[in-house]
């Protein structure tokens, strides 16, 4: 079944942008001016998820790349990774659970909770130039709030 998708950029609540760091990792850092063109453009898709009153299930792909953010166990710890997929089959309404994030919007701020690992969130560090990761705490040192902006193609 077809899915609703959009193109967007994400910035954390400290206004750090997300950029590629090697082929399979994202990092967060402050960008200005022409450097803003480095930030990754996501293709966010509305997918099937578990019933909820305040969470909207989405998948986060990298625009025009066959890469999706996914959540897997590595060394017994929930971990965020970029995973290659067959572009002929993605995005799809029924995404595998590791690709699904529950988007939670509060006061124009977005959180992305892993559907596979409840209470684990896409996170950034306070420090500059650090990897984007899956964090198991909210409201602590690490940042779990993001803003989204559409990207015009």
């Amino acid at each position: 079944a077809p899915v609703r998708s959009l193109n967007c950029t994400l910035r954390d609540s400290q206004q750090k942008s997300l950029v590629m760091s090697g082929p399979y990792e994202l990092k967060a850092l402050h960008l200005q001016g022409q450097d803003m063109e480095q930030q990754v453009v996501f293709s966010m898709s509305f997918v099937q998820g578990e019933e909820s009153n305040d969470k909207i299930p989405v998948a986060l792909g990298l625009k025009e790349k066959n890469l999706y953010l996914s959540c897997v166990l590595k060394d017994d710890k929930p971990t965020l990774q970029l995973e290659s997929v067959d572009p002929k089959n993605y995005p799809k309404k029924k995404m595998e659970k590791r690709f699904v994030f529950n988007k939670i919007e509060i006061n124009n701020k977005l959180e992305f909770e892993s559907a596979q690992f409840p209470n684990w969130y896409i996170s950034t560090s306070q420090a500059e130039n650090m990897p984007v990761f899956l964090g198991g705490t909210k409201g602590g040192q690490d940042i779990t709030d993001f803003t989204m902006q559409f990207v015009s193609s």
Epitope: P2, F46, S52, K103, M148, F150, V151, S152, S153
Partner: antibody
Framework: EVQLVESGGGLVQPGGSLRLSCTVS????????MSWVRQAPGKGLEWIGI???????YYASWAKGRFTISKDTSKNTVYLQMNSLRAEDTAVYFC?????????????WGQGTLVTVSS | EIVMTQSPSTLSASVGDRVIITCQAS??????LSWYQQKPGKAPKLLIY???TLASGVPSRFSGSGSGAEFTLTISSLQPDDFATYYC??????????FGQGTKLTVL
């Protein structure tokens, strides 16, 4: 305060074209999706389509081809281009804001603009 | 495309009555359903989203329930301001968003 104001409605001949505008304030089109909905006289609500970013628009099956939604974020304005108009397109046309991205529901509406298709 | 069917199409009731409007989807939409109220010459107003969550500023006499393909809107004690037309809306079925045909609530 969230405000949406439609304009551009009026009388148009069958086969003609019309472009409606929806100018918004109190929020940014760079982070909210916008739908167009119409209501024929004495009839129910009919969803036309929705726009996210400029490349991501979705339409009701009956609207594909004749109706096009676009936007100019710098002007805080969303447009509905209507072509090959027919008498049955006579309706009040509303723009509406999606409450949250992909929520589908609409928490802010304009007052509507009347389009009459008649010779 | 998913078709939304409301019943009844018209409903007459008195102030203080308990009123129930139903909405049926042609296939399961989980809890992706909203309800709107519309008065003549006015824009619709969002009442309930995700089948049961009250929108901001909506009185608690309104409630929604259901999941899958069967949904209800209940007004526990009808007030004079509640006479209007009510619409259900599928918000999550694929790329398309569809309204029911409406239920007109009139004074008995």
């Amino acid at each position: 305060e969230v405000q949406l104001v439609e304009s551009g409605g009026g009388l148009v001949q069958p086969g003609g074209s019309l472009r409606l505008s929806c100018t918004v304030s109190g929020f940014s089109l760079s982070s909210y999706a916008m739908s167009w909905v119409r209501q024929a006289p004495g009839k129910g609500l009919e969803w036309i389509g929705i726009i996210y970013d400029s490349a991501s628009t979705y339409y009701a099956s009956w609207a594909k081809g004749r109706f096009t939604i676009s936007k100019d974020t710098s002007k805080n304005t969303v447009y509905l281009q209507m072509n090959s108009l027919r008498a049955e397109d006579t309706a009040v046309y509303f723009c509406a804001r999606e409450r949250q991205i992909f929520s589908g529901d609409m928490d802010g509406w304009g007052q509507g603009t009347l389009v009459t298709v008649s010779s | 495309e998913i078709v939304m069917t409301q019943s009844p199409s018209t409903l007459s009731a008195s102030v203080g009555d308990r009123v129930i409007i139903t909405c049926q989807a042609s296939q399961s939409i989980d809890n992706w359903l909203s309800w709107y109220q519309q008065k003549p010459g006015k824009a619709p107003k969002l009442l309930i989203y995700r089948a049961s969550t009250l929108a901001s500023g909506v009185p608690s006499r309104f409630s929604g329930s259901g999941s899958g393909a069967e949904f209800t809107l209940t007004i526990s004690s009808l007030q004079p301001d509640d006479f209007a037309t009510y619409y259900c809306q599928n918000t999550g079925g694929g790329v398309s968003i569809a309204f029911g045909q409406g239920t007109k609530l009139t004074v008995l």
